[in-house]
């Protein structure tokens, strides 16, 4: 339905508070280097303008698109060229090219200082004295560091952030109450950001069809009692929501997400028996809850899939008449029967089935040709099953830290050209799969493991895209979304790699190592491990294990010494020499 003023429409739909928060997130995700105060100023100007349009939709400029209004506002920033370089050239373009230009300049790894958490009392004072500013600062800091964060979900996180401070700043032991909550929010936020980054990459790099296919698989697993028409409706609406958010259309995205939540709650009976609790919650919690709802129970009387998709004489006719609908139905039917499969596996099976039909439907005896198509699925299913079994065994054997090290060695040997910080970050995240998934019951393991790995490998892909250094990474990242994980798994040691020259500075450590948190110490050690592998790519796991044990002993010894710095200076070069010998 057409509105005279889009900005007035969204302001009225969302309400002033959410409108302002979403505009702040949008601006922070576009201009990631701008100071907080500058963004607040821009947001207030936009909000005042929106109010004039609510009062009179025919007022000057109120008929302009949101992209035009927001783009014009961003282009008023005085220091645009100094701060952002060629992003300033976007302002010379017309919409929609200008918005596309801004999107292309979003930086997944902006050069921003790490967020330092102030003392609890300092945070509580700031929260109590300037609650609104404090919460808006949270939105700003998260949004600028995560330019693809799912905006309506970020508002939910801000609400949880507020609740944590409201509760804990009144507690007897503020720190004991607040810090675990903030840690949990930080971890959940990073996970949410990474998941959304995969959705945006899927849409932007592989198109709407790829995203819709993934959504059909997931929605069908969640709502196995819903019929195909209902699943299609939810998937279409969900695709619109994510397309908008990934495209920077955050007001439309949040508005449409609320509409979808409303629809789902009004149609619970035909979707899932698991929505009741979610639908009793207020908007932000409701949408979050619906997005994370558990799978409904499978209907008892599901027919054999082979009837319609293998044994039917009409397979080729149905496929030819409406390929996308037919494949959508296949994916829906297969997915609702297999909550135990990862979404990526389900998409691979659909791809294999489609390839078989393409081949067989052109033959004289199509049925004879595709009669055994489901048997061909077996190796595709066994591959992630083996992956889960093997990696969970390793995780249980080693524990998270040593499992991360195992993966770090594996991936450094596969793609040694990738920067060490990226290899460490990605391997640490890959290693967390064990903690997250290996304790799950058998039926939940594969979807947990493989779909989580897809999220983490997408982080590698987006970081690598910024500064491409490895053709192998580029190939795995760009050829096929659904085959990314198998592509990386299949990579062997890169035999073409020339070992990195030894740099003593890389392996020189100081007393400051002792004051680092456990996590920071691990990162330091893992950085050294990756550099060691780059220097000696032919080193065996046993050799590397010995060196790492010696290194851990060296750190422990020197951190116990009276003169720590002297110990590091004296023992460090000895360790390096011994390691060189051990790895010769």
């Amino acid at each position: 339905d057409a509105h005279k003023s889009e900005v007035a429409h969204r302001f009225k739909d969302l309400g002033e508070e959410h409108f302002k928060d979403l505009v702040l997130v949008a601006f922070s995700q576009y201009l990631q280097q701008c100071p907080f105060e500058e963004h607040l100023k821009l947001v207030n100007e936009v909000t005042e303008f929106a109010k004039t349009c609510v009062a009179d939709e025919t007022a000057e400029n109120c008929d302009k698109s949101l992209h035009t209004l927001f783009g014009d506002k961003l282009c008023t920033v005085a220091t645009l060229r100094e701060t952002y370089g060629d992003m300033a050239d976007c302002c010379a373009k017309q919409e929609p090219e200008r918005n596309e230009c801004f999107l292309q300049h979003k930086d997944d790894k902006p050069d921003l200082p790490p967020l330092v958490r102030p003392e609890v009392d300092v945070m509580c004072t700031a929260f109590q004295e300037h609650e609104d500013t404090f919460l808006k600062k949270y939105l700003y800091e998260v949004a600028r560091r995560h330019p693809y964060f799912y905006a309506p979900e970020l508002l939910f996180f801000a609400q949880k952030y507020k609740a944590a401070f409201t509760e804990c700043c009144q507690a007897a032991d503020k720190g004991a109450c607040l810090l675990p909550k903030l840690d949990e929010l930080r971890d959940q936020g990073k996970a949410s950001s990474a998941k959304q980054r995969l959705k945006c990459a899927s849409l932007q790099k592989f198109g709407e069809r790829a995203f819709k296919a993934w959504s059909v698989a997931r929605v069908s697993q969640r709502f196995p009692k819903a019929d195909f028409t209902e699943v299609t409706k939810v998937v279409t609406d969900l695709t619109k929501v994510h397309t908008e958010c990934c495209h920077g259309d955050l007001l439309e995205c949040a508005d449409d997400r609320a509409e979808l939540a409303k629809y789902m709650c009004e149609n619970q009976d035909s979707l899932s028996s698991k929505l009741k609790e979610c639908c009793e919650k207020p908007l932000l919690e409701k949408s979050h809850c619906l997005a994370h709802v558990e799978n409904d129970e499978m209907p008892a009387d599901l027919h054999a899939l082979t009837d319609d998709y293998v044994e039917s004489k009409d397979v080729c006719k149905n496929y030819a008449e409406a390929k996308d609908v037919f494949m959508g139905m296949f994916l829906y039917e297969y997915s609702r029967r297999h909550p135990d499969y990862s979404a990526m596996l389900l998409l691979r099976l659909a791809k294999a089935y489609e390839a078989t039909l393409e081949k067989c439907c052109a033959t004289a005896d199509p049925h004879g040709c595709y009669a055994k198509v489901f048997d061909e699925f077996q190796p595709l299913v066994e591959d992630p099953q083996n992956l889960v079994k093997h990696n969970c065994e390793l995780f249980e054997q080693f524990g998270e830290y040593k499992f991360q090290n195992e993966l770090l060695v594996r991936y450094t040997k596969k793609v040694p050209q990738v920067s060490t910080p990226t290899l460490v970050e990605v391997s640490r995240n890959l290693g967390k799969v064990g903690t997250k998934c290996c304790k799950q019951p058998e039926a939940k393991r594969m979807p947990c493991v493989e779909d989580y790995l897809s999220v983490v490998l997408n982080q590698l892909c987006v970081l690598h895209e910024k500064t491409p250094v490895s053709d192998r990474v580029t190939k795995c990242c760009t050829e096929s979304l659904v085959n990314r994980r198998p592509c990386f798994s299949a990579l062997e040691v890169d035999e073409t790699y020339l070992p990195k020259a030894f740099n003593a500075e890389t392996f020189t450590f100081h007393a400051d190592m002792c004051t680092l948190s456990e996590k920071e110490q691990q990162v330091k050690k893992q950085t050294a491990l990756a550099e060691l592998v780059k220097h000696k790519p032919k080193a065996t796991n046993e050799q590397l294990k010995t060196v790492m044990e010696d290194f851990a002993a060296f750190v422990e010894k020197c951190c116990k010494a009276d003169d720590k710095e002297a110990c590091f200076a004296e023992e460090g070069p000895k360790l390096v020499a011994a390691s060189e010998t051990a790895l010769a």
Partner: antibody
Framework: EVQLVESGGGLVQPGGSLRLSCAAS????????MGWVRQAPGKGLEYIGI???????YYASWAKGRFTISRDNSKNTVYLQMNSLRAEDTATYFC???????????????WGQGTLVTVSS | DIQMTQSPSSLSASVGDRVTITCQSS????????LSWYQQKPGQPPKLLIY???DLASGVPSRFSGSGSGTDFTLTISSLQPEDFATYYC???????????FGGGTKLTVL
């Protein structure tokens, strides 16, 4: 007892619509394709169409557009929606269970007793 | 549209006779054998006798048999019994489920 029972027939004016139901008992409809066949008074059998277990529908060329078959597995019922009815649609309408699940083999091994539809002004 | 032609359209015979009814399709049936035979008595729904050209449906006496392939098929009743007087229909399945078709019927009466 395994049986199919049609209902919804009756007198309808030309141009009118009617929805016939076919309720199954003693077995689950989700395991077989279900077809509709009609028989004008004193005439032979005429195939209307079929719905597969997965919901794929297939219609005789003359029925396409006017007739729609659907199923509700939770109610164990198949439906035939008939629109723009004409005098020549007067017949007994049977629902029948095909031997196959995904298509029409022409071998219907379980039939309902039929419901009479009369189109007349 | 695909035509199914049954002959004869009517037939009189006596108890104990051997009776043959033929069915011809304008196109080959699916897999060359997707043809069924039905028996219908007044006021009753049809009853499946034969499927896949020659397979006897459950509970059907062995005096009924079917044969044929492609476009030409035959239903044989080896020794007619009093309860066999009825109308018989053939039905063919073709490469598309939309094309399933019945023959015009053969009315078998007492001579």
């Amino acid at each position: 007892e395994v049986q199919l029972v049609e209902s919804g027939g009756g007198l309808v004016q030309p141009g009118g619509s009617l929805r016939l139901s076919c309720a199954a008992s003693g077995f689950s409809l989700s395991s077989n394709a279900m077809g509709w066949v009609r028989q004008a008074p004193g005439k032979g059998l005429e195939y209307i169409g079929i719905i597969s277990v997965g919901g794929f529908t297939y219609y005789a060329s003359w029925a396409k557009g006017r007739f729609t078959i659907s199923r509700d597995n939770s109610k164990n019922t198949v439906y035939l929606q008939m629109n723009s009815l004409r005098a020549e649609d007067t017949a007994t309408y049977f629902c029948a269970r095909d031997r196959h699940g995904g298509d029409s083999s022409g071998a219907f091994y379980l039939w309902g007793q039929g419901t009479l539809v009369t189109v007349s002004s | 549209d695909i035509q199914m032609t049954q002959s004869p359209s009517s037939l009189s015979a006596s108890v104990g006779d051997r009776v043959t009814i033929t069915c011809q399709s304008s196109e080959s049936v699916y897999s060359n054998n997707q043809l069924s035979w039905y028996q219908q008595k007044p006021g009753q729904p049809p009853k499946l006798l034969i499927y896949d050209a020659s397979d006897l449906a459950s509970g059907v006496p062995s005096r009924f048999s079917g044969s044929g392939s492609g476009t030409d098929f035959t239903l044989t009743i080896s020794s007619l019994q009093p309860e066999d007087f009825a109308t018989y229909y053939c039905a063919g399945g073709f490469s598309s489920s939309s094309d399933t078709a019945f023959g015009g019927g053969t009315k078998l009466t007492v001579l």
